[in-house]
Interface confidence: low
């Protein structure tokens, strides 16, 4: 190889060894037969030289620092070339390194030709291999502003009083050309401006200059993202820390053309900005820190831009002003994320401040609007408590339980509303009753319905679920003794379609002490499945619930039991099933953890059936299936 | 009305040049990207650059790069497309687009023939 | 750069069938998907953009999905006014933009 550097090219190249690889034979630079394992070349030099392995790329490295001096003459702008170039060097992994120095007064533009940079952080690299380094000057310290990879979207990088540039390549890579010009700027007044040019949908993550280490005190560091009219932006910090500030404060300014507040002021630990149409400028200020303690001010952030669907030109007004106790969360449906780039799904309040997810509470109206490349990414759940603190002013009193029309509006699917309805102990029991008769939903017979109501006891102690429950059945009504929640679950989009078959009311009511009572009223064409509160787990120690069966003056009704024993184990007192006829009140007892169930049997009068549990052996719990089957009577036994 | 309006085509011999123009009416062509695309004979779409004024982003398709300049004069909403070093493989009607939900609005074209 | 690699290249119809066409994008674009419909000697009309969503003024019967880098056009009732070339374009991030070979639709 012959390496020849002409005088005046400020250009010094050192091969020298690199990262040290366990390799059984070591290889040297051979200069004039003299061994040596680094070689400096200077301008004005001309040296030969070979390698005495086959791979010396294994075992040195070049560098070739160019030295441009803006200070006391012309600064060389423009297309910065390979000197020397490529092919005139050996095949090593090679850094190329540009220093400019100049002037405070003037500003260096680095720009970047199309595949533009993306920045990395620590511990990422880059597919090719091929990396540039960036750093800046404050006086004599030097300040790295970023290592970047191809295929990004930084287009320009503003510096003042100098720029250090590297260019990693490696040594099996073809590049022949810089891919960046510099050209000088009027002073910028701050330590760099990053240009980000997106072109379409994407994202690009970006950190402050020394990222991870601390930025510069008081120093200012200022972002330009030129984002195409259609296009929405948000703004999300994936890390930051702040320093001890002695005097000034620590913050983010978004310079958002059009807006009458520029610039918008941001602690770093805001909710950043999003939704944003056009281009816009972000920039993080430094404080005077403390002089003993100073901490690290570092940030971390992503752009994500990406196109708005219709909704998100929209405003949604959601009136939650006549509500009370009642609170609405739109998040994200849990998903398997992929690995590829999904574009962002935010919900916005008064269009600006974007999150993942939004919780809006009663007492006023709120302004949404979405981002988001596809709005089944969300749902919404609500809570709603409806509690009653006098139980002589709640007596008899009824409350809807009905998803408000304003709901409907918004498009996005309701996931949970719950009703959280609460009573005073021991004072008032509740009543729930449905528009429409129910059906509980069980193996043997699934709810299809687009909707189910879960009921579940809404005591913390208390681990009592009565079971899932959709129009189409034959439940009338259901009392609960204390308090409980009512869940309406959707299952299909087409709930909206069916949103007039929901609605339940529920009443405060006398106290009674059983956990639960079922009104059934069969339906002729159809068995009524039933079970236990609670199943596959078992019905809760010391817990009774009854099941009220009307029979039709015309049918007799079948009891089936789905197992022949229960298979409870007592570890103290008995589990007992009582069926009682209700006009003659005569009534049979069986022993659930003694006896077998009963056999199918025939009741033409409406009838109880009651449960008792006992206090189990665990593993060896209380669960019960039976149906009732109506049959017309074929001879009048009354 | 939102109207693009090109010009500037016409019958050129190899290695010829032409500028295009495209005039636009409704809008503020530096708030949006402006294309270029072309469609030769009997054959489909390709684009060929596009521009935002705005920020003096240019961009352009592989066959075209080094040949043709994008630019835009802002005073007169007209976008232009230099076309240099011109090929046979050029021959093609020029549409110019501005871009918004997609590529919005279309100019009514204009025909370039390279050919000796 | 992203090959939209579209199909059919040419379909015959009736009036009323239901029409698919298919694209399919050679890495991850995203929605970033737009449909065209052009007729001899006329401009592209822009039918779908981002991948799914109707272009104001364009009828109900044309719509748009993604499955991944899959894109389809639909016509529901291919009417008379139909019967034109079809093309699919992306343009997602800072990669050129690049439109699909089109499909031609004609009367059977």
């Known amino acids: 190889f012959e390496i020849a550097l002409p005088r005046e090219s400020n250009i010094t190249v050192l091969i020298k060894l690199g990262t040290p690889t366990l390799l059984a034979k070591p290889c040297y630079i051979v200069i004039s037969k003299r061994h040596t394992t680094m070689l400096s070349i200077k301008p004005g030099e001309r040296i030969l030289f070979t390698f005495s392995c086959q791979s010396p790329e294994n075992h040195f490295v070049i560098e070739i620092q160019k030295n441009i001096d803006c200070m006391s003459g012309p600064c060389p702008f423009g297309e910065v070339q390979l000197q020397p170039s490529t092919s005139l060097l050996p095949t090593l992994n090679r850094t190329f390194i540009w220093d400019v120095k100049a002037h405070k007064s003037i500003g260096l533009e680095l720009q970047f030709s199309i595949p533009r940079l993306r920045q990395f952080g620590p511990g990422e690299s880059c597919p090719d291999g091929v990396t540039y380094s960036i750093s800046g000057r404050i006086d004599a310290t030097v300040v790295r502003i970023g290592t970047f990879c191809s295929n990004g979207t930084v287009s320009r990088i503003k510096m003042q009083e100098g720029v250090k540039m590297a260019l990693h390549l490696p040594w099996f890579h073809p590049r022949n050309v810089s891919g960046f010009s510099i050209a000088n700027r009027s002073s910028i007044k701050r330590l760099c401006i990053i240009e980000s040019v997106f072109e379409g949908e994407g994202s690009a993550t970006l950190m402050s200059a020394n990222y991870p280490e601390g930025f510069p005190e008081d120093e200012l560091m200022t972002w330009q993202f030129v984002i195409p009219a259609h296009l929405r932006a948000s703004v999300s910090f994936l890390n930051f820390n702040l320093s001890n500030c002695e005097r000034k404060e620590e913050r983010v300014e978004y310079y958002i053309p059009g807006s009458t507040t520029n610039p918008e002021v941001f602690k770093l630990e805001d909710k950043q900005p999003g939704n944003m149409a056009g281009n816009f400028n972000l920039s993080l200020q430094g404080c005077d820190q403390d002089a003993q303690n100073p901490g690290i001010l570092r940030l971390q952030f992503q752009v994500l831009v990406q196109h708005p669907q219709n909704e998100s030109n929209k405003i949604y007004v959601v009136d939650l002003s006549n509500e009370r106790a009642t609170s609405l969360t739109i998040e994200p449906r849990p998903v398997k994320q992929s690995r590829k780039f999904v574009p962002g799904c935010f919900v916005c309040l008064e269009s600006r401040t974007c999150s993942t997810n939004l919780t809006l509470t009663s007492g006023s109206k709120h302004k949404i609007s979405f981002l988001c490349d596809n709005l089944t990414r969300l749902w919404m759940n609500v809570e709603k408590n409806i509690s009653c603190t006098d139980h002589r002013y709640c007596q008899r009193k009824s409350y809807s339980l009905q998803v408000p029309s304003d709901i409907f509006h918004l498009p996005v699917e309701l996931h949970d509303f719950s009703w959280k309805l609460l009573v005073p102990k021991d004072r008032l029991s509740l009543v729930l009753v449905p528009a429409q008769k129910l059906q509980q939903h069980t193996h043997e017979k699934p709810c299809n319905t687009s909707f189910s109501y879960l009921v579940a006891s809404a005591i913390p102690s208390q681990d009592l679920y009565f079971g899932s429950f959709c129009p189409g059945g034959s439940i009338e009504q259901i009392q609960v003794k204390q308090n409980i929640s009512v869940t309406l679950r959707t299952f299909a989009p087409s709930f909206r379609q069916e949103a007039s078959r929901q609605g339940l009311t529920v009443s405060f009511i006398p106290y009674f002490k059983e956990e639960g009572v079922f009104t059934v009223t069969p339906d002729t064409k159809s068995k009524v499945y039933l079970r236990t509160p609670n199943w596959d787990r078992g019905l809760p120690s010391l817990t009774s619930v009854s099941w009220n069966i009307s029979v039709p003056r015309d049918q007799v009704a079948c009891l089936t039991f789905f197992k022949e024993r229960t298979g409870v184990v007592c570890q103290t007192g008995r589990a007992f099933m009582i069926i009682q006829e209700q006009r003659t009140r005569a009534e049979e007892i069986f022993s659930l953890d003694e006896d077998a169930l009963p056999k199918p049997r025939f009741h033409h009068h409406s009838f109880w059936v009651n449960i008792s549990n006992c206090s189990p052996a665990s593993g060896k719990q209380l669960d019960l299936l039976f149906w009732v089957t109506l049959t017309p009577r074929t001879v009048d036994l009354t | 009305e939102v109207q693009l309006v090109e010009s500037g085509g016409g019958l050129v011999q190899p290695g010829g040049s032409l500028r295009l123009s495209c005039a636009a009416s409704g809008f503020n062509l530096s708030y949006y990207y402006i294309h270029w695309v072309r469609q030769a004979p009997g054959k489909g779409l390709e684009w060929v650059a596009s521009i935002y004024s705005s920020s003096s982003y240019t961009s352009y398709a592989d066959s075209v790069k080094g040949r043709f300049t994008i630019s835009a004069d802002t005073s007169k909403n007209t976008a232009y497309l230099q076309m240099n070093s011109l090929r046979a493989e050029d021959t093609a009607v020029y549409y110019c687009?501005?871009?918004?939900?997609?590529?919005?609005?279309w100019g009514q074209g204009t025909l370039v023939t390279v050919s000796s | 750069d992203i090959q939209m690699t579209q199909s059919p290249s040419s379909l015959s119809a009736s009036v009323g069938d239901r029409v698919t066409i298919t694209c399919r994008a050679s890495?991850?674009?995203?929605?970033?998907v737009a449909w065209y419909q052009q007729k001899p000697g006329k401009a592209p009309k822009l039918l779908i953009y981002?991948?799914?969503s109707l272009y104001s003024g364009v009828p109900s019967r044309f719509s748009g999905s993604r499955s991944g880098t899959d894109f389809t056009l639909t016509i529901s009732s291919l009417q008379p006014e139909d019967f034109a070339t079809y093309y699919c374009?992306?343009?997602?991030?800072?990669?050129?933009?690049?439109f699909g070979q089109g499909t031609k639709v004609e009367i059977k």
């Open positions: 374009q992306q343009s997602y991030y800072y990669y050129p933009i690049t």
């Open positions: 981002s991948a799914s």
């Open positions: 687009a501005r871009a918004y939900y997609g590529f919005d609005y």
């Open positions: 890495q991850s674009v995203s929605s970033a």
